[in-house]
Interface confidence: low
């Protein structure tokens, strides 16, 4: 439905508060280096303009597209060239090329200072002094560090952030109330950002068809009682929502997400029996709840898949008729029967089925050719099952920190060219699969583990894409979205790698390590471990373990010493010498 003024339409649909928040997120995700005050000024100008359009949709410029209005506004930033360099060239382009240009300059790893959490009393004072500015600042800081964060979901996080301060700043022990809530929001926020980044990568790098296939599989697992046509409608609408958000169209995205939640709740009888509680919540909570809702129970009377997809004489006729619809039906039917499989496994099975039909439907006897197609699925199913079993056993034996270290060594040997901070970040996240998924029963382990690994490996892919250094990473990241994890799993030690020269500075530590949190201390140690492997890729597990044990003892000893700095200097030299000897450096 066409509107005279798109900006007025979205302002009326979303309301002023959400409109302003979403425009701030959009601007902060595009111009990630701009100061907070500059963005607030731009947002206020856009909001005042939107209000004039609400009053009179025929007013000057009200008929312009949102991309034109927002792009024009961003291009008024005086320091664009000094701050952003070639991104300023985007402003010479016309829409839609200008918006595409801005999108291409989004930085997954912007050079921004780490967010340091102030004292609780300082935060509570700031919250009480100016609640609106305090919450805007939260949106701004998250959005600029996570340029693909799912905007309507960020509004939900901000609502929880506000609720935490409202409750805890009145509590007797403010810190005990607030800090766990902020930790939870931080961890959930990072996970949410990474999940959305995979959705955007899927759409942008592999296209709408790839995203739709993912969505068919996931929604069919979640809503196994829904008809195929119903699932297809949800997939189409969900694809539109995520295409918009990934494309920077945050107002449209939030509006369409609200419409989708409304539709789902109005039609929950034909979708899922698990939606009742979600649908009683306010909008932001409702949308979040629907996105996280547990799988409905499978219908009891589902017939064998073989009848329609193997035994039927019409398989090739049905396939030729509408290939994507027939494959969609296959994926739907398989996924609704297998909540115990990961989405990426289901997509591998569908791809195998498609490849078989392409080959067999051109053969002399198609039925004879594809009769055994389901037998080809067995090894595809067993591979992730075995991998998860082995890694969960290793995790249970080592615990999270040492399991992360095992993965650090494994991945540094596979792709030693990747930067140390990226290897540490990615391997730490890969290692979290243990505590996240290994506690689950068998039936839930694979969807938990493999789909989580897809999210983490996508982080590696987007970080590597910014500064490509490894052909092996590029190959695994670009060849097939669903085979990324098997591709990385299959990589052996990179025999072509020339070890890094030894640099004692890398292994020099100071007393400041003693005041770090346990997590930060672990990261320091894990950074040293990666550097060791880069120096000595052929080092055995035993050698590396011995050096890391010595290192841990050294840190503990010097942190207990009276003159910490002297201890780190003197004992550090001894440790470096001993490590060099142990590793034959």
């Amino acid at each position: 439905d066409a509107h005279k003024s798109e900006v007025a339409h979205r302002f009326k649909d979303l309301g002023e508060e959400n409109f302003k928040a979403l425009v701030l997120i959009a601007f902060a995700q595009y111009l990630q280096q701009c100061p907070f005050e500059d963005h607030v000024k731009l947002v206020n100008e856009v909001t005042e303009f939107a209000k004039t359009c609400v009053a009179d949709e025929s007013a000057e410029n009200c008929d312009k597209s949102l991309h034109t209005l927002f792009g024009d506004k961003l291009c008024t930033v005086a320091t664009l060239r000094e701050t952003y360099g070639e991104m300023a060239d985007c402003c010479a382009k016309q829409e839609p090329e200008r918006n595409e240009c801005f999108l291409q300059h989004k930085d997954d790893n912007p050079n921004l200072p780490r967010l340091v959490r102030p004292e609780v009393d300082v935060m509570c004072t700031a919250f009480h002094d100016n609640e609106e500015t305090f919450l805007k600042k939260y949106l701004y800081e998250i959005a600029r560090r996570h340029p693909y964060f799912y905007a309507p979901e960020l509004l939900f996080f901000a609502k929880r952030y506000k609720a935490a301060f409202t409750e805890c700043c009145q509590a007797a022990d403010k810190a005990a109330c607030l800090l766990p809530k902020l930790d939870e929001l931080r961890d959930e926020g990072k996970a949410s950002s990474a999940k959305q980044r995979l959705k955007c990568a899927s759409l942008q790098k592999f296209g709408e068809r790839a995203f739709k296939a993912w969505a068919v599989a996931r929604l069919s697992q979640r809503f196994p009682k829904a008809e195929f046509a119903e699932v297809s409608k949800l997939v189409t609408d969900l694809t539109k929502v995520h295409t918009e958000c990934c494309h920077g169209d945050l107002l449209e995205c939030a509006d369409d997400r609200a419409d989708l939640a409304k539709y789902i709740c109005e039609n929950q009888d034909s979708i899922s029996s698990k939606l009742k509680e979600c649908c009683e919540k306010p909008l932001l909570e409702k949308s979040h709840c629907i996105a996280e809702v547990e799988n409905d129970e499978m219908p009891a009377d589902l017939p064998s898949l073989a009848a329609d997809f193997v035994e039927s004489k019409d398989v090739c006729k049905n396939y030729a008729e509408a290939k994507d619809v027939f494959l969609g039906m296959f994926l739907y039917e398989y996924a609704r029967r297998h909540p115990d499989y990961s989405v990426v496994l289901l997509l591998r099975l569908a791809k195998t089925y498609e490849t078989t039909l392409e080959k067999c439907c051109a053969a002399a006897d198609p039925h004879e050719c594809y009769a055994k197609v389901f037998d080809e699925f067995k090894p595809l199913v067993e591979e992730p099952q075995n991998l998860i079993k082995q890694n969960c056993e290793l995790f249970e034996q080592l615990g999270e920190y040492k399991f992360q270290n095992a993965l650090l060594v494994r991945y540094t040997k596979k792709v030693p060219q990747v930067s140390t901070p990226t290897l540490v970040e990615v391997s730490r996240n890969l290692g979290k699969v243990g505590s996240k998924c290994c506690k689950h029963p068998e039936a839930k382990r694979m969807p938990c583990a493999e789909d989580y690994l897809s999210v983490v490996l996508n982080q590696l892919c987007v970080l590597h894409e910014k500064t490509p250094v490894s052909d092996r990473v590029t190959k695994c990241c670009t060849e097939s979205l669903v085979n990324r994890r098997p591709c990385f799993s299959a990589l052996e030690v990179d025999e072509t790698y020339v070890p890094k020269e030894f640099n004692a500075e890398t292994f020099t530590f100071h007393a400041d390590i003693c005041t770090l949190s346990e997590k930060e201390r672990q990261i320091k140690k894990q950074t040293a471990l990666v550097e060791l492997v880069k120096h000595k890729p052929k080092a055995t597990k035993e050698q590396l373990k011995a050096v890391m044990d010595d290192f841990a003892a050294f840190v503990e000893k010097c942190c207990k010493a009276d003159d910490k700095e002297t201890c780190f200097a003197e004992e550090g030299k001894k440790l470096v010498a001993a490590s060099q000897a142990a590793l034959g450096l």
Partner: nanobody, 116 residues
């Protein structure tokens, strides 16, 4: 809700013509192959014709080949069946369905009666 509403049926003499329409809503019409199926009194469903999602590929049952034409308008979310040279054995309730041959109807159908 997924909805398929058939219309255009009626009473027609042998040799006459009718044009059936099927208005689709509640799903991504342009993404799906569509079919017409029919059910004669006291009989099971019989596939009549199918068209792929773009409209470039059409299929017909031998019994209607050369007389019926299936088409679609994706802008209007509508499926059509042009029926010429109608015969008494074409008498049936006609349904549109999502998918290719073998698709199951979900609408109410439209009655076509060919009789002199």
């Amino acid at each position: 809700q997924v909805q398929l509403v058939e219309s255009g049926g009626g009473l027609v003499q042998p040799g006459g013509s009718l044009r059936l329409s099927c208005a689709a809503s509640g799903f991504a019409f342009r993404g799906f192959g569509m079919s017409w199926v029919r059910q004669a009194p006291g009989k099971g469903f019989e596939w009549v014709s199918s068209i792929n999602n773009g409209g470039s590929d059409t299929r017909y049952a031998d019994s209607v080949k050369g007389r019926f034409t299936i088409s679609r308008d994706n802008a209007r979310n509508t499926l059509y069946l042009q029926m010429n040279s109608l015969k008494p054995e074409d008498t049936a309730v006609y349904y549109c369905a999502i998918g290719g041959p073998g698709a199951s109807p979900s609408g109410q159908g439209t009655q076509v009666t060919v009789s002199s």
